[in-house]
Amino acid sequence: RKIPKVGHTFFQKPESCPPVPEGSMKLDTGIINENQRVSMSRNIESRSTSPWNYTVTWDPNRYPSEVVQAQCKHLGCINAQGKEDISMNSVPIQQETLVLRRKHQGCSVSFQLEKVLVTVGCTCVTPVVHHVQ
Amino acid sequence: RKIPKVGHTFFQKPESCPPVPEGSMKLDTGIINENQRVSMSRNIESRSTSPWNYTVTWDPNRYPSEVVQAQCKHLGCINAQGKEDISMNSVPIQQETLVLRRKHQGCSVSFQLEKVLVTVGCTCVTPVVHHVQ
């Protein structure tokens, strides 16, 4: 899923208020819902008919520092006999997400949002039939 | 996938620098990679063996204002005959993502990151067999 562009009004104050200095805003350091629990079904990446692996990328100047990317293991999908069936296709499911980028210039530290495309997992699809010309 | 807690050092300046006022930081208003293109396989939500629907939630004080959640359509998976097979399970693939929350207090506007749990799509898995005792 794609994140739309940020509207030019999102960072502005209400019309009745004095304008904000161009280019930067106040970011509170706490994170809302930081402790929320994620409950994912167990080991779905290996139990899926379109299984995937994970690769971790690390960047200390990004929050979250760790971004995990999935890669589909197969071209096809795993059938009931545990064999790859290329009459079906494993395809990635992707999500645009936001991360927070930390920028240093000497003792000046600022932050900026960054869009990152994350492959979250894979699903098994019926291929679109292409008739040979 | 779960986003870890933000480290207490992430918002701090280097040790040799004067400390930052507690609680808020400078957020640049531009977004890095705002124009990147997302290419998702075509209509995978309806062609998947574990198909899903989308529901959109809208909040004008959040960026992105629109957050799309997937819901698996079936308990089982769709077989080659187009019928639901409950010997397999459709399960959601979830991803913790960050959004930016806008907070008003009169003419004072500040921003805060918020964790949101997004269901991105569904995948078909072999169920875990529970033996009756």
């Epitope: 293991k73 197969h74 071209l75 296709n89 990635p92 992707q94 492959t119 291929p127 | -």
Partner: nanobody, 123 residues
Framework: DVQLVESGGGLVQPGGSLRLSCAAS????????VGWFRQAPGKEREFIGA????????YYAVSEKGRFTISRDNSKNTLYLQMNSLRPEDTAVYYC????????????????WGQGTLVTVSS
């Protein structure tokens, strides 16, 4: 977007070997199925084979099985085609291609293509 640039083509003698590379730029190379096609002079573009995002699943067109080996290195964003026991009939422009779905790639309907690299097998 994904940009693909092939390299490694050239003139080789019959019975010789060649390794083609395809460098991809783009943030999520590992989420793509990638593969190779070739087009001989005056002929249709022909599918050679493809490899899954993780590199664990490889599919070859029957005619090329054994002589050609496809591999990928996601840490380098690169796809490879190792060609052995080359014959004059292998002379063609070789194209690297990428898509998120094997079904599209296999039938030449990929979203992304390189510009091709020429391989000439001749004594």
């Amino acid at each position: 977007d994904v940009q693909l640039v092939e390299s490694g083509g050239g003139l080789v003698q019959p019975g010789g070997s060649l390794r083609l590379s395809c460098a991809a730029s783009g943030r999520t190379f590992s989420s793509y199925v990638v593969g190779w096609f070739r087009q001989a002079p005056g002929k249709e573009r022909e599918f050679i084979g493809a490899i899954s995002g993780s590199g664990e699943s490889i599919y070859y067109a029957v005619s090329e099985k054994g002589r050609f080996t496809i591999s990928r290195d996601n840490s380098k964003n690169t796809l490879y085609l190792q060609m052995n026991s080359l014959r004059p009939e292998d002379t063609a422009v070789y194209y690297c291609t990428a898509d998120q779905e094997f079904g599209y790639l296999r039938f030449g309907r990929s979203e992304y293509w390189g510009q091709g690299t020429l391989v000439t097998v001749s004594s």
